[in-house]
């Protein structure tokens, strides 16, 4: 008796596909050992066709895969484009050789069944309509025309030319003739359901001279498309329902026992479990739309169905499309915090993962908005300038090659709370969702800049200091100058910052930045921050206004400036190869609104980074002669 279990007999039709699930006992060894699918020959040998080690035989190339689901103690063999040659005896099993634990599976692939030659077959999907053609001889032209559905004993009327209609076909069946052709009538049945499948007879005239035609109507439920996605990745359900439902409300629902629970629809309904991680996008006028879900969870696995109906709810007899989503817990996407907490006035540094094989992809950060169908306007990106309302407080730091980029948002307010997405123009599976929670601050911030009303005088020396607590003593401190293309780290030289010290004086921990001499280009936002290697920590921002020497009062109100100064910022380009690409508008507004939709821009010849290299000051020359120093006291 084998501990492996699966279907003993699988029967399918040529051209179709099978998905065979094999169950194995719950042990660590079983979860990690080789899984295989082999075909038994007459000699008793079992020839491997596919295995979890990556082996794929020639006859399965491009039409089969094997996926292990260790969390369920199952593995699945999917085989497509079946032919009668696939009929045979197989084994699914575990072990380094094909003599390990296994289960016998018999696969039978049949030809599409044939019906008597005088039967016309109509094959339609659920929710669609069919037009049955019923020919007759000219002498039966004046006679009654009818369509009936065969039951065990009799043939039950569907509709006839005297306008009699079976109650279950009212509003769905129409009998008509086209033009002047008096040798054929038609019956159209719309909103087809499973119950409409069966044998029909259309008839013109009565008695032995009547014209009869046999019709076999097959109403197919769409076969679920199998989707295999990693935990924390994203999935897109592409739904194509056809032109006839283009103007109806669209929905995506998940099968739940008896019902299909709507997750999202175009009428504004949305399941709270998907808050912050779902968008529905109408594609065109042909009834096509897509639903994107990010941050996949284990419990998202299941059967999904999309459809269209004026109610935005599933309705029998309306077209649908179905999927079965599997969520694999052996995910390549790192487990990151899905909730980030900040306080008013403070800052957050969000580490966004991306596919490390795509380090040159463009990185973006957008804010999910649930109104309407949901959309995610881009706030910052490697080639997308920071949105105006985030001036001075948002920057993206790209850390090439390590699979992470960082987004920093400071000067937090409670209005910043919400859902944000990390995404690239590369591998769409790596879209991740972060919920930002902002609480009212109950204590002083960790980083404080003095003077707070920073107005520098042209040509003079100006110093600002950033005070930090002892807990940041061992971390790297930095100043950077913000522009809408990033925050460029300023060159620093340490003055005794790393001298060994037994005690830490809370009052004297500070890092200073000096502008000498002050130029007009120095005006703008500056950030003081801490980081450890490539991991960014807290930041604080200050606006430095620059005024000419005058006897009168300052022409810039420093308080207003520090709140959110709207000053035209200039910033030299770090990498000359970036400049001509910098201000490209990204066309096609969609779920990523404000004409900044993320599109696959294609391979970049090199990595285009608008934000400065956080770890070095190389190449960051200044257009003015002012000197930047970091002094540690």
């Amino acid at each position: 008796k084998s501990p492996i279990f699966g279907p003993q007999e699988v029967s399918s039709i040529e051209g179709d596909s099978v998905s065979i699930t094999c169950y194995y006992p719950d042990t660590s060894v079983n979860r990690h050992t080789r899984k295989y699918w082999c075909r038994q020959g007459a000699s008793g040998m079992c020839t491997t066709l596919i295995s979890s080690n990556g082996y794929l035989s020639k006859e399965y190339s491009g039409r089969a895969n094997l996926i292990n689901f260790p969390e369920n103690n199952t593995f699945v063999i999917n085989i497509e484009q079946l032919t009668q040659d696939d009929t045979g005896s197989y084994k699914c099993g575990l072990g380094t050789s094909n003599r390990g634990l296994s289960f016998d599976v018999s696969l039978e692939v049949s030809q599409v069944p044939e019906l008597p030659s005088d039967t016309h077959v109509y094959t339609k999907d659920i929710g669609r309509n069919v037009t049955i053609e019923c020919p007759f001889k000219r002498e039966n032209a004046p006679s009654k025309k009818s369509l009936c559905k065969k039951t065990n004993q009799s043939c039950e009327l569907v509709i006839d030319s005297t306008e009699k209609v079976n109650p279950s076909y009212i509003g769905r069946a129409k009998l008509f003739m086209k033009g002047t052709d008096l040798t054929v009538f038609y019956v159209n049945i719309s909103h087809l359901t499973h119950n409409d499948a069966g044998l029909y007879i259309c008839q013109a005239g009565e008695g032995p001279s009547a014209d009869k035609k046999n019709v076999d109507l097959q109403v197919l439920a769409p076969e679920p498309e199998l989707l295999y996605k990693d935990l924390r990745s994203s999935v897109t359900f592409e739904c194509d329902l056809g032109r006839e439902v283009a103007n109806e409300a669209k929905y995506l629902c998940r099968m739940n026992k008896e019902t299909c629970d709507v997750i999202i629809n175009t009428l504004g309904k949305r399941d709270p479990d998907f808050e912050g991680r779902i968008l529905i996008t109408p594609k065109d006028d042909n009834g096509r739309f897509s639903v994107l879900i990010t941050g996949l969870r284990k419990e998202d696995a299941g059967h999904y169905q999309c459809g269209a109906h004026s109610s935005g709810l599933p309705q029998e007899g309306w077209p649908i499309q179905t999927w079965q989503l599997f969520v694999n817990e052996e995910s390549t996407i790192p487990n990151r915090r899905s909730v980030v907490k900040g306080v008013t006035g403070g800052s957050v540094a969000i580490a966004c993962p991306y596919n490390p094989k795509e380090s040159s992809s463009l990185k973006y950060w957008c804010r999910w908005e649930g109104d309407g169908n949901g959309h995610c306007p881009v706030l910052v990106g490697t080639q997308a300038q920071v949105q105006e309302e985030y001036e001075g407080r948002l920057a993206l730091f790209d850390q090439p090659g390590n699979g992470t980029y960082t987004v920093i948002l400071n000067q937090l307010t409670t209005e910043d709370a919400g859902f944000y997405w990390c995404l690239t123009n590369g591998d769409s599976r790596w879209r991740t969702t972060i919920e930002l929670q902002v609480a009212e601050a109950t204590r002083e911030p960790n980083l404080e800049v003095t003077p707070q009303n920073a107005t520098a005088v042209l040509g003079e020396t100006f110093t600002v200091s950033c005070h930090y607590p002892c807990k940041f003593y061992s971390q790297e401190k930095y100043w950077c100058k913000w522009s809408n293309k990033g925050c460029h780290i300023l060159p620093s030289h340490d003055e005794g910052a790393r001298q060994s010290s037994v005690s830490c004086d809370q009052s004297s921990q500070l890092v200073s930045m000096t502008l000498n001499p002050v130029s007009k280009e120095d005006e703008g936002w500056y950030w003081c921050g801490v980081k450890q290697g490539q991991t960014y920590g807290e930041t604080t921002a200050i606006y430095i206004a620059v005024e000419e020497r005058t006897r009168g009062s300052s022409h810039v109100n420093p308080t207003d400036a520090n709140a959110r100064a709207k000053v035209a910022l200039e910033e030299e380009v770090v990498d000359s190869s970036i400049s001509e690409k910098e201000n490209k508008a990204i066309p096609n507004p969609g779920p990523f609104a404000n004409e900044r939709e993320i599109q696959n821009v294609g391979d970049q010849a090199q990595e285009n980074r608008a934000s400065g290299d956080a770890g070095s000051a190389d190449g960051q020359s200044r257009s003015s002669s002012s000197k930047h120093h970091h002094h540690h006291h």
Epitope: E9, S12, I126, E258
Partner: nanobody
Amino acid sequence: EVQLVESGGGLVQPGGSLRLSCVASGLPGSSSRMAWFAQAPGKEREFVAAIAWRGRTSYKYYSDSVKGRFTVSGDNAKRTLDLQMKDLNPEDTALYFCAAHPNDDGDPRISGNYQYWGQGTQVTVSS
């Protein structure tokens, strides 16, 4: 409302045959799974056989104790399930339940993976 009605149970001699039938009305979903479970007096319900449909493909499952003796068949469109039982022995005596689920999720041997149940039909194997 989903209803499952079993029929075909009865008294049969050891070595004899019996055919059980089940009709499910109102079962939602396009793919589905239907199964037979047996409950002997004082025992837990045990998996006997199942059939799952996905599109035009069917998958048949059997417990080790009935392999080669019982044959499961059915029609997804009509939502019917049959169990042809041959070479019956006294250990097969039980109340046979028909179970159905609107899709093919989860291990078919586990009774918790079925949403709907019939009332059962008694099979007694005795001389």
